[in-house]
Interface confidence: medium
């Protein structure tokens, strides 16, 4: 079986203030079983921008359906976009556990990059 | 050649702590998980936890949680397993196991390489 | 947790005979299922991954099987080296539950 790999396509994405950002992120297996979740940096200080099991991210929405059991898409988009979003954000595929989840594999990250809004 | 080479034996009092070190060589430490499976004396094997050495996090199983540790030193390629608050009825064999799959594989498929384990009586 | 109901715990057999132990997983965990031998005073080894896959050196005589949430191991004619307890573990979400094991002895 080929390995599962976590395709994050753009190195890096320029957005302009109060627009929204789109992340793109694939799996290429659906197993392992385990939610994705989304950060923004690595390491200890990652601060989660969203979770595929659980809570409330009212300004990110998926680009696809996550519930269809043979999705493997898990873009993101961001809305309403302000210079303190940018960083680089990582797409993170996790393995299913009881009572937790285990980090299985990271993709290579996207640079989000925040514009002046244009006047 | 690939191997797991764990700590001496241990003999600890009720309510101490025990830690048991794992040295892995002959492959790549940070691209395979590493389970603790424990046997009581005369019984069957007893999954206690995993840990992923790339990045560190942990999976523990519901009756360990709290008392139990698992942590890696990738400079050593070491991990670790800390039991606190002993009683009796951890006195046991403890392995450190390789999860093999976990890199060349879609999914992590069953360990395939085990320390020789590790001896920890609790006595008072 | 998965609960893995193995049975059975312990059986006799001749050499030669075909020795069968079953392995019930307490819902669908697909073909995520191993099979260990452990031989006293030592730590187990990998015989069959993925429900029915021989892992590299393990001899033929070995084999498993599914059905459902069933699972089966099967040795096809039983050695004097064979003397060991065998158990299953599912591996397709944590914790990596065993079963409770099948001591074989040589009648």
């Known amino acids: 079986e080929d390995e599962l790999q976590v395709i994050q396509p753009e190195k890096s994405v320029s957005v302009a203030a109060g627009e929204s950002a789109t992340l793109r992120c694939a799996m290429t297996s659906l197993i392992p079983v385990g939610p994705i979740m989304w950060f923004r940096g690595a390491g200890a200080g990652r601060e989660l921008i969203y979770n595929q099991k659980e809570g409330h991210f009212p300004r990110v929405t998926t680009v696809s359906e996550l519930t269809k059991r043979n999705n493997l898409d898990f873009s993101i988009s961001i809305s309403n976009i302000t210079p303190a979003d940018a960083g680089t954000y990582y797409c993170v595929k996790f393995r299913k556990g009881s009572p937790d989840d285990v980090e299985f594999k990271s993709g290579a990250g996207t640079e989000l990059s925040v514009r002046a809004k244009p006047s | 050649q690939v191997q797991l080479v764990q700590s001496g034996a241990e003999v600890k009092k009720p309510g101490a702590s025990v830690k048991v070190s794992c040295k892995a060589s002959?492959?790549?430490?940070?691209?395979?998980?590493m389970v603790w499976v424990r046997q009581a004396p005369g019984q069957g094997l007893e999954w206690m936890g995993i840990i992923n050495p790339s990045g560190g996090s942990t999976s523990y199983a519901q009756k360990f949680q709290g008392r139990v540790t698992m942590t890696r030193d990738t400079s050593t390629s070491t991990v670790y397993m800390e039991l606190s608050s002993l009683r009796s009825e951890d006195t046991a064999v403890y392995y450190c196991?390789?999860?093999?799959?976990?890199?060349?594989?879609?999914?992590?498929?069953?360990?395939?390489?085990w320390g020789q384990g590790t001896t920890v009586t609790v006595s008072s | 947790d998965i609960q893995m109901t193995q049975s059975p715990s312990s059986l006799s057999a001749s050499v030669g005979d075909r020795v069968t132990i079953t392995c019930q997983a307490s819902?669908?965990?697909?073909?995520?299922l191993n099979w260990y031998q452990q031989k006293p005073g030592k730590a187990p080894k990998l015989l069959i991954y993925d429900a029915s896959n021989l892992e590299t050196g393990v001899p033929s005589r070995f084999s498993g099987s599914r059905s459902g949430t069933d699972f089966t191991f099967t040795i096809s004619s039983l050695q004097p080296e064979d003397i060991a307890t065998y158990y299953c573990?599912?591996?397709?979400?944590?914790?990596?539950?065993f079963g409770g094991g099948t001591k074989v002895e040589i009648k």
């Open positions: 196991a390789r999860e093999g799959g976990y890199g060349y594989r879609a999914y992590p498929y069953g360990m395939d390489v």
């Open positions: 819902q669908d965990i697909s073909n995520s």
């Open positions: 002959g492959y790549t430490f940070t691209s395979y998980y």
């Open positions: 573990q599912q591996v397709i979400i944590l914790p990596l539950t």
